[in-house]
Every structure is written in structure tokens, then in C-alpha cells.
Interface confidence: low
């Protein structure tokens, strides 16, 4: 009979683990991937039939420090005329990531991981039309 | 690592820094469960540049599964249901943060990994490069 | 809605082999690791084996590992246990458990239940 | 493995009180803790999820709290149906672990 493939097997904790204190994980900050760039379409929050703008909210004690937000810029989309079609709806699309907050209690600091939602771009979407009996 | 004001009457107040490694209490502030887009809206469906989510699945990432959209088509759906290829669906990218266990398997010991994904597609005029 | 309902259960005797099922239904199966549970009578919750949604990334407790293989066919929806060279140690209720992307053993099955003895 | 200790092992309670449910654990699990609810002859169902986060259509007289090796179920005020066997799991190692059970009662 063929065994399966066995993709990990880690239920002994390997020798070589860090210790890690009490109610605390260790968590390394230099970033794997740290240098790929998004390498999207110029322009696209201009060029979209659901424009959006960009705010950059930026906090000192947050990695990253810099999270951009994107607001869709019309309730409707833009049509090939170049005018709000409020038949169409522009709608945000969102991700979730994590950052990492830095808290400080006095002299002490700690350190938190939070999931924060980001509004990365708009698109344009065919409404859902609610019949009323 | 990111410069950090701290209070001067600290030791060590020089270091702005984020450190290279820190302990994290990892009581994951603001959680919530719409990890899998297909729940949290349909608006990969019924986008005029709608998309096709793929799973990818890392059991030593956190969290182990993220998706990525990929666009259905060059163009944009007409109200007729027809694609326009005089517009384009193009993706829409960014980069996030996620956890990855190392060394590997460890329980309690991660690093920060960035990762570049497609989260969903809109419809864009093309840009039109005129030949002299 | 999710349902998840477990199927294969039956006496056995030691040694023998049992195969469980669970058919699964109300989400994109292929989209998440399934994982077997099991609970003796009276006792508390043990987990067994977790397999990943696309099956390559499979994971055995010690109690079973060599004896029990989990396998999962996404074109039926189905999750599955082969259970071999049972001992009565075995005797529980079987659940299959979806997981969520954050780890979380979020739907349950009813259960189905496996008695080795001779 | 990580050993996760529930105490008590039962509790007897009238309706209308506070539960007050412990979870130890033998190494820190960060706050990779879920609490389940089994009624008998029934599964377990998912209450709260990374220590503190309750599970979706869970009731708001449910809350977690804690991290690392210490963790704390409450049922704010106890409803009829809230009578049931409450276990911990931990997924923050290999295998994922179960506490052995606590056995909320009608006093």
C-alpha cells in the first residue's frame, strides 16, 4: 500500500528553539521579503472607472509606521463619458495585514501584534437591487 | 527598524530603533474571522473587472491560508454581460504582513514576513502609447 | 450553512479496520484542513490527524501514527480516516472538524462512533 | 507536548451567577487558545477563539482573557443552557492539545 506523503511531521519541539519567556512569543523584525516592491499598473487609482484616493495615516510606534489607506473617490463610477454613473457602485476592496505596536508603560516597553484592515483600491460592482413585496 | 520617540529620562534612550528581536504578546488586537474574502462580500462576482480567488496555504504561516485574485479577463464586463477590451482589468496589489514560524516548527518563536498580494481587480482606462 | 456529518462508525474487533467518512457540505471544502478528534466514553477531546486542504501537508497523533491514514477527496467533498490494526484504546466518538485559516477548529460534525472489542 | 490543566473539574452554579473556568498551560501558547462548549450527546462547538475573541453567534456573557500559560473563561451570568462540559485547546504547538474538561452544573 503507498504511504502518503507526510508534508511535516513536528510533534516533538526541536531541540534548537529559542527559550521564550512566560505569556510572550519571540518574534524576529527583520523582514523575510522586506525589499519586493508592489509592482502594480501606473496610476490605476486614476485610471479606474471606481477612482480612489490615498491617505497615509503615520505612527512613530507602529511597524510599519506608514499605513496607506485608499477612499473611493464616488458613490457611482465613472462611464466612458467620463461622468458618475449612479446605476454602478464604487466599492473598497480590503486586505487584512499585521503590524507591530510598540506600548510604553513608563520606562518599560512592550511589544503587540495587531490586525489592522486596509482599504487598498475600489472597484466598480453591479448593485444588489432589494425588491420590495 | 522604525525610529521610536522614548521618554530621555529612560536608559538606553538613544535606541530608537526597533529592535531585531522582541517578545510579543500575542494577543492579536482587532481580530476578526473575514480571512476567507469569499465570505466577507461578493464583490469579486459582481466587479465590472470581477476576479477568481486562489487559496494559498502555508501550515507553518500565520495565518496559514491567504487568497489571491487573479482577474478573469483582459477587459471589463458591459452591463450586457459582454467584455469591452478597449478597457482593462488590472490587479490590485499590496503588501502585507505575516507571521512565519523560525527556526522552523518552533512553537513560540516567529519572524515577520512581507508578502505581496492581489486583492481584488478594477477596471481601467488603458494607457495608449501614440507611435510617432 | 456549514454541515459536516461523519459516517463509518461500527464494532470492531481488535486488530480489525475500520474506514470513517465525512461528508462535508455549505463551503469551498477544498479550501480549508480538515482534522479528525476523538472523544472515549467519559473522556475529554483527543486530537487524531489533520490534513491540509489541498492534502499535502498531513499530520498524525502519536497514538495512531503507522495505523491510521487520513485522506481527503475534494471532488466528493469528502474527508476519510482509514483506521488499521485497531485496539480497544480506539473505542471513542470521531469527529471531523473544519479549520479556519487562523488554526481554529471552527465547525464540528456530529459524530461517529467505533467500538473495538472482542 | 504542551499539557493544558482545566480546574475545577466541576462547578456547581445556580442560574444567574458567574462562571469563573481556568486553563493552564505547561509551556506559553501565546494566545493560541480556543474555548469549546459540548453538551451531552452532542459536539463541541467553538465559543471563543485566540484567547479572547468570541466565536461568531456566540453571546456577549461569554468572554476569554489571558495569555502565554494563563487563561480564564467567563459566563457572565449563567442561562439554563449553559449547563455543559468547557475544554481548552491550544494550537500554538504540535499536536494541538486539549485541557481535560470542565463541568459546569446546576448547583
Known amino acids: 500500500r503507498k504511504i502518503p506523503k507526510v508534508g511535516h511531521t513536528f510533534f516533538q519541539k526541536p531541540e534548537s528553539c529559542p527559550p521564550v519567556p512566560e505569556g510572550s512569543m519571540k518574534l524576529d523584525t527583520g523582514i523575510i521579503n522586506e525589499n519586493q516592491r508592489v509592482s502594480m499598473s501606473r496610476n490605476i487609482e486614476s485610471r479606474s472607472t471606481s477612482p480612489w484616493n490615498y491617505t497615509v495615516t503615520w505612527d512613530p510606534n507602529r511597524y510599519p509606521s506608514e499605513v496607506v489607506q485608499a477612499q473611493c473617490k464616488h458613490l457611482g463610477c465613472i462611464n466612458a463619458q467620463g461622468k458618475e454613473d449612479i446605476s454602478m457602485n464604487s466599492v473598497p476592496i480590503q486586505q487584512e495585514t499585521l503590524v507591530l505596536r510598540r506600548k510604553h508603560q513608563g520606562c518599560s516597553v512592550s511589544f503587540q501584534l495587531e490586525k489592522v484592515l486596509v482599504t487598498v483600491g475600489c472597484t466598480c460592482v453591479t448593485p444588489v437591487v432589494h425588491h420590495v413585496q | 527598524g522604525i525610529a521610536i520617540p522614548r521618554n530621555s529620562g529612560c536608559p538606553n534612550s538613544e535606541d530608537k530603533n526597533f529592535p531585531r528581536t522582541v517578545m510579543v504578546n500575542l494577543n492579536i488586537h482587532n481580530r476578526n474571522t473575514s480571512t476567507n474574502p469569499k465570505r466577507s462580500s461578493d464583490y469579486y462576482n459582481r466587479s465590472t473587472s470581477p476576479w477568481n480567488l486562489h487559496r494559498n496555504e502555508d501550515p507553518e504561516r500565520y495565518p496559514s491560508v491567504i487568497w489571491e485574485a487573479k482577474c478573469r479577463h483582459l477587459g471589463c464586463v458591459k452591463a450586457d454581460g459582454n467584455v469591452d477590451y478597449h478597457m482593462n482589468s488590472v490587479p490590485i496589489q499590496q503588501e502585507i504582513l505575516v507571521l512565519r514560524r523560525e527556526p522552523r516548527h518552533c512553537p513560540n518563536s516567529f519572524r515577520l514576513e512581507k508578502i505581496l498580494v492581489s486583492v481584488g481587480c478594477t477596471c481601467v482606462t488603458p494607457i495608449v502609447h501614440h507611435v510617432a | 450553512e456549514v454541515q459536516l456529518l461523519e459516517s463509518g462508525g461500527g464494532l470492531v474487533q481488535p486488530g480489525g479496520s475500520l474506514r470513517l467518512s465525512c461528508a462535508a457540505s455549505?463551503?469551498?471544502?477544498?479550501?480549508?484542513?480538515m482534522n479528525w478528534v476523538r472523544q472515549a466514553p467519559g473522556k475529554g477531546l483527543e486530537w487524531v490527524s489533520t490534513i491540509s486542504g489541498r492534502g499535502g501537508s498531513i499530520y498524525y497523533a502519536d497514538s495512531v501514527k503507522g495505523r491510521f491514514t487520513i485522506s481527503r477527496d475534494n471532488s466528493k467533498n469528502t474527508l476519510y480516516l482509514q483506521m488499521n490494526s485497531l485496539r480497544a484504546e480506539d473505542t471513542a466518538v470521531y469527529y471531523c472538524?473544519?479549520?479556519?485559516?487562523?488554526?481554529?477548529?471552527?465547525?464540528w460534525g456530529q459524530g461517529t462512533t467505533v467500538t473495538v472489542s472482542s | 507536548e504542551i499539557v493544558l490543566t482545566q480546574s475545577p473539574a466541576t462547578l456547581s452554579l445556580s442560574p444567574g451567577e458567574r462562571a469563573t473556568l481556568s486553563c493552564r498551560a505547561s509551556?506559553?501558547?501565546?494566545?493560541?487558545l480556543a474555548w469549546f462548549q459540548q453538551k451531552p450527546g452532542q459536539a463541541p462547538r467553538l465559543l471563543i477563539y485566540?484567547?479572547?475573541n468570541r466565536a461568531t453567534g456566540i453571546p456577549a456573557r461569554f468572554s476569554g482573557s489571558g495569555s502565554g500559560t494563563d487563561f480564564t473563561l467567563t459566563i457572565s451570568s449563567l442561562e439554563p443552557e449553559d449547563f455543559a462540559v468547557y475544554y481548552c485547546?491550544?494550537?500554538?504547538?504540535?499536536?494541538?492539545?486539549f485541557g481535560q474538561g470542565t463541568k459546569v452544573e446546576i448547583k
Open positions: 472538524a473544519k479549520e479556519e485559516a487562523t488554526w481554529d477548529f471552527d465547525y
Open positions: 485547546q491550544q494550537r500554538s504547538n504540535w499536536p494541538p492539545t
Open positions: 509551556q506559553s501558547v501565546s494566545s493560541f
Open positions: 455549505g463551503f469551498t471544502f477544498s479550501s480549508y484542513a
Open positions: 485566540d484567547a479572547s
